[in-house]
C-alpha cells in the first residue's frame, strides 16, 4: 500500500502527539550527545513539514522517504563533527547507507552524566510549570541513554510517568506516593531496554532467521492453542515490527505494532484465551499487556512428537522440501508442549534436530540414523536444570548481595580483561536472577532464569563489542546466540591472564562512602572485590571472604567514627597492608 507521502501517512496514522514523541526518540537515539533544546527544535521543524504534507501530499519533498527526511534533518546539526567525530562522515553518504552508518554509531554506553533525581517538590513544580516539556525531557533522557529502547513501549512508559506525577503531585505525602512509582519505572525501564537490546542484537548479528526462530518458540509457548499458520503469521508481523524499531524506523514500527495488536485482539479466539483483559485496554496499555500476557493452557491430549518427527517415513522428504517450514513446525510443536523450558533451550533442541536431519537425510539408512534423535535432547535439558538448581541453592544460602559477589569472583576469573565497571554491572544483574526466578516453582524456573541470563549476557556482549579486550568473550558472544550462556558457564579460570599490578589508590576509600545509598555502597565494595581478583586471580574463596569481611567492618567502623576521613586514611592503610599479607600480594 504505497502512499504518495510516507511522512503524511505516518502523521495521520499516529496522530501529532505520538508522531512528535517518536521523532524525538529517533533523533535522541541517533544523536545521543545533542542538547535537549536542539532536538526539540529539529522535531518541531519535522512536525511542521509533516503538516504541510498532510495538507498536500504532492507538496515539495513530501514524497521523500522518512530516512531521507530525518537524515537530512540530522545532518543540519552544526556541531556534528566536533561532537560526534567520524559519525559526521555518515552525512556524505546516500540512503540507505547513511542510515546504516548512523545505526553503526549508536553507542550502548554513551559518555553521559548519571541521571540524578531532583527533590520531589522540584520535580512537581517542573511538571506543573510545563508538562509537555517535562515529559519530552523524560523521553529524551531515556532514549539517548538507551539507543535501542523499544520506542512504542517508551511511549507507554512516558504515559505511566505522566500518570505518576499527575497523581502524586496532588498527594499529601508526595514523596511516599511518587518515589516508589519512579523506582518501579526505572527498574522496569532498564529491564525493558535490555530485553529489546537482545532482540536487536539477534536481528543485527544473527539475522532474521534467528529472530524468527526465537519468536516461534516464545509465541508457541504463549499461545499453545493457536495453529501453526497463526503463529507463523504473528511471527512474520512481529519480526517486521522489531526489524523496523531496531533499524531506527520508529514511526513504521509503532504503526505496525498498533496494527498487530489490533489483529491479535480481532482474532483472539484463534490465538489465546488470556487476551480478553488486554484487549479492553487503550492502545499503549493493550500492546504492553499482550507482550507480557501469561501462557495460555496447553491443549489436552497433544499427540507424541515422535510420530511426525521421528517415526514418519516422510521426515526427510518433508525436511528437504521446505527445511525452515518443517523446522518451524518442530519448534512450534515442541515449544507449545514445553512452557517449562527456556526459549534458548528449545532453540538448542531445534538446532540439534536440524543438525541430525542434515546428517541423516543424506545417510544410507536415514531412519536408523535419526531414530534416537530425541535421546540427544536429554543432556541438553538436564544441563540448565542442574545449573539452575545449584545456583538457586547457592542464592538461598547466601542471599542476593553475597550471591552477586560469588558471581563477580566467578566471572572475573573467567574474563579478567573485561573492565571493572562492566564486570560489576553484569555480575550484579546476573545475581538478580536469584530473587527474580528462584522463588518460582520448578516449572517456571528455567524459562525465567535462562532467558533472563540471555538478556544479561547480551549486555556483556554489546558492551564488550564497543571495546573488545577478551577473545573468550568475543568467541562466546559471536559463535552462537543460543549457546552464549553455556559457553560462558563452561569457561574456566583464564590461566593466560597476567595479574594486574597492585595500586593502593584502587583500595583507598573516603568518608563520602558513608552517605551513599546501600546500593551504591555495595557497588563500591563489589568494585573493590573485582580489583582484588584481578590482582590475585588465584585467591581462594576463603581468602577473598576474609578480606571482604574485613573491608565491610572497616567501612562500618569508619562511618561511625567522629573523624571519618582520618579513620578512612589510617585504618585504610592498615586494611590494605593486612589484605596484601592475607593474599600474599
Amino acid at each position: 500500500d504505497a502512499h504518495k507521502s510516507e511522512v503524511a501517512h505516518r502523521f495521520k496514522d499516529l496522530g501529532e502527539e505520538n508522531f512528535k514523541a517518536l521523532v524525538l526518540i529517533a533523533f535522541a537515539q541517533y544523536l545521543q550527545q545533542c542538547p535537549f533544546e536542539d532536538h526539540v527544535k529539529l522535531v518541531n521543524e519535522v512536525t511542521e513539514f509533516a503538516k504541510t504534507c498532510v495538507a498536500d501530499e504532492s507538496a515539495e519533498n513530501c514524497d521523500k522517504s522518512l530516512h531521507t527526511l530525518f537524515g537530512d534533518k540530522l545532518c543540519t546539526v552544526a556541531t556534528l563533527r566536533e561532537t560526534y567525530g567520524e559519525m559526521a562522515d555518515c552525512c556524505a553518504k546516500q540512503e540507505p547507507e547513511r542510515n546504516e552508518c548512523f545505526l553503526q554509531h549508536k553507542d550502548d554506553n554513551p559518555n553521559l552524566p548519571r541521571l540524578v533525581r531532583p527533590e520531589v517538590d522540584v520535580m512537581c513544580t517542573a511538571f506543573h510549570d510545563n508538562e509537555e516539556t517535562f515529559l519530552k525531557k523524560y523521553l529524551y533522557e531515556i532514549a539517548r541513554r538507551h539507543p535501542y529502547f523499544y520506542a512504542p513501549e517508551l511511549l507507554f512508559f512516558a504515559k505511566r510517568y505522566k500518570a505518576a506525577f499527575t497523581e502524586c503531585c496532588q498527594a499529601a505525602d508526595k514523596a511516599a506516593c511518587l518515589l516508589p512509582k519512579l523506582d518501579e519505572l526505572r527498574d522496569e525501564g532498564k529491564a525493558s531496554s535490555a530485553k529489546q537490546r537482545l532482540k536487536c542484537a539477534s536481528l543485527q548479528k544473527f539475522g532474521e532467521r534467528a529472530f524468527k526462530a526465537w519468536a516461534v518458540a516464545r509465541l508457541s509457548q504463549r499461545f499453545p492453542k493457536a495453529e501453526f499458520a497463526e503463529v507463523s503469521k504473528l511471527v512474520t508481523d512481529l519480526t517486521k515490527v522489531h526489524t523496523e524499531c531496531c533499524h531506527g524506523d520508529l514511526l513504521e514500527c509503532a504503526d505496525d505494532r498498533a496494527d498487530l495488536a489490533k489483529y491479535i485482539c480481532e482474532n483472539q479466539d484463534s490465538i489465546s484465551s488470556k487476551l480478553k483483559e488486554c484487549c479492553e485496554k487503550p492502545l499503549l496499555e493493550k500492546s504492553h499487556c499482550i507482550a507480557e500476557v501469561e501462557n495460555d493452557e496447553m491443549p489436552a491430549d497433544l499427540p507424541s512428537l515422535a510420530a511426525d518427527f521421528v517415526e514418519s517415513k516422510d521426515v526427510c522428504k518433508n525436511y528437504a522440501e521446505a527445511k525452515d517450514v518443517f523446522l518451524g513446525m518442530f519448534l512450534y510443536e515442541y515449544a507449545r508442549r514445553h512452557p517449562d523450558y527456556s526459549v534458548v533451550l528449545l532453540l538448542r533442541l531445534a538446532k540439534t534436530y536440524e543438525t541430525t536431519l542434515e546428517k541423516c537425510c543424506a545417510a544410507a539408512d536415514p531412519h536408523e540414523c535419526y531414530a534416537k534423535v530425541f535421546d540427544e535432547f536429554k543432556p541438553l535439558v538436564e544441563e540448565p536444570q542442574n545449573l539452575i538448581k545449584q545456583n538457586c541453592e547457592l542464592f538461598e544460602q547466601l542471599g542476593e548481595y553475597k550471591f552477586q559477589n560469588a558471581l563477580l569472583v566467578r566471572y572475573t576469573k573467567k574474563v579478567p580483561q573485561v573492565s571493572t565497571p562492566t564486570l560489576v554491572e553484569v555480575s550484579r544483574n546476573l545475581g538478580k536472577v536469584g530473587s527474580k526466578c528462584c522463588k518460582h516453582p520448578e516449572a517456571k524456573r528455567m524459562p525465567c532464569a535462562e532467558d533472563y541470563l540471555s538478556v544479561v549476557l547480551n549486555q556483556l556482549c554489546v558492551l564488550h563489542e564497543k571495546t573488545p579486550v577478551s577473545d573468550r568473550v568475543t568467541k562466546c558472544c559471536t559463535e552462537s546466540l543460543v549457546n552464549r550462556r553455556p559457553c560462558f558457564s563452561a569457561l574456566e579460570v583464564d590461566e593466560t591472564y597476567v595479574p594486574k599490578e597492585f595500586n593502593a589508590e584502587t583500595f583507598t576509600f573516603h568518608a563520602d562512602i558513608c552517605t551513599l545509598s546501600e546500593k551504591e555502597r555495595q557497588i563500591k565494595k563489589q568494585t573493590a572485590l573485582v580489583e582484588l581478583v584481578k590482582h590475585k586471580p588465584k585467591a581462594t574463596k576463603e581468602q577473598l571472604k576474609a578480606v571482604m569481611d574485613d573491608f565491610a567492618a572497616f567501612v562500618e567502623k569508619c562511618c561511625k567514627a567522629d573523624d571519618k576521613e582520618t579513620c578512612f586514611a589510617e585504618e585504610g592503610k592498615k586494611l590494605v597492608a593486612a589484605s596484601q599479607a592475607a593474599l600474599g600480594l
Epitope: 522428504k317 528437504a320 546428517k359 543424506a362 545417510a363 544410507a364 540414523c369
Partner: antibody
C-alpha cells in the same frame, strides 16, 4: 570450489592390503558423508559404504563388510578406504563421492585404479 | 537389497530425436538420482531427487517417476549427450545403482 583429490594408482600383491585416500577441500568436510564407489572395467557402479567425518559414523554395503574399512581425518580433511585380503576381484577403479541430502552424490573424485596381481 | 533394472542396456539416437530410458526398482524407493559417465572419467550427477537438474545440465533433460518406476528423458538428442547413464536409489540401505544405459549417437 569443492574438490575431491584421490591418491594415485596402486599395484599390489594378492593377500595384501591397501589404503586409498581422498583429500577434500572447498567445503565443511565434517558435515557431509563421504561415499566410496567401485567400478570394474566395462562394468557398472557398486556402492561400498559411507563415513560421516563429523562423528565417524559409517554405513557399509553388506557385500563389503570385512573387505573395506572407512576412516576420516578432520585435520587434513581426508577420507580413507582400506581394502584388505586383496584378490584379483578387487581390481577396479575406486571413487570417492560427497553425499548430500536425499542421497545423491554431487561431487566425485577422479578415481584411483587398483590392480591386484602377482 | 533393492535391485535397479535399467532399460534398454544400449540404445542409439539421432540428433534431434527424443530419448527415454527407464529404471525399474524391485521395490518402492523414495528418490531416484541419475548420473552421466563418459569414457575415462568419473560419473557426474545429472538428475537428482527424481526430477531436479544438476548445475550445468541442459534443460532438454528431465526426470520423473515414483514408487518403482522412474525415467530420464532427453527432449532432443545432441551429440554431447552420448554417454552411459546410471540410476541410483536412495531410501533403502544399501544404496544401489542400475547397470547403466549406454546411449550412442546414431
Amino acid at each position: 570450489q569443492v574438490q575431491l583429490q584421490q591418491s594415485g594408482a596402486e599395484l599390489v600383491r594378492p593377500g595384501s592390503s591397501v589404503k586409498i585416500s581422498c583429500k577434500a577441500s572447498g567445503y565443511a568436510f565434517s558435515n557431509y558423508w563421504m561415499n566410496w564407489v567401485k567400478q570394474r572395467p566395462g562394468q557398472g557402479l557398486e556402492w561400498i559404504g559411507q563415513i560421516y567425518p563429523g562423528d565417524g559414523d559409517t554405513y557399509y554395503n553388506g557385500r563389503f563388510k570385512g573387505k573395506a574399512t572407512l576412516t576420516a581425518d578432520k585435520s587434513p580433511t581426508t577420507a580413507y578406504m582400506q581394502l584388505s585380503s586383496l584378490t584379483s576381484e578387487d581390481s577396479a577403479v575406486y571413487v570417492c563421492a560427497r553425499g548430500v541430502i536425499l542421497g545423491s552424490f554431487d561431487y566425485w573424485g577422479q578415481g584411483t585404479t587398483l590392480t591386484v596381481s602377482s | 537389497q533393492i535391485v535397479l533394472t535399467q532399460s534398454p542396456a544400449i540404445m542409439s539416437a539421432s540428433p534431434g530425436e527424443k530419448v527415454t530410458m527407464t529404471c525399474s526398482a524391485s521395490s518402492s524407493v523414495s528418490y531416484m538420482h541419475w548420473y552421466q559417465q563418459k569414457s575415462g572419467t568419473s560419473p557426474k550427477r545429472w538428475i537428482y531427487d527424481t526430477s531436479k537438474l544438476a548445475s550445468g545440465v541442459p534443460v532438454r533433460f528431465s526426470g520423473s517417476g515414483s514408487g518403482t518406476s522412474y525415467s530420464l528423458t532427453i527432449r532432443s538428442m545432441e551429440a554431447e549427450d552420448a554417454a552411459t547413464y546410471y540410476c541410483q536409489q536412495w531410501g533403502s540401505n544399501p544404496l544401489t545403482f542400475g547397470a547403466g544405459t549406454k546411449l550412442e549417437l546414431k
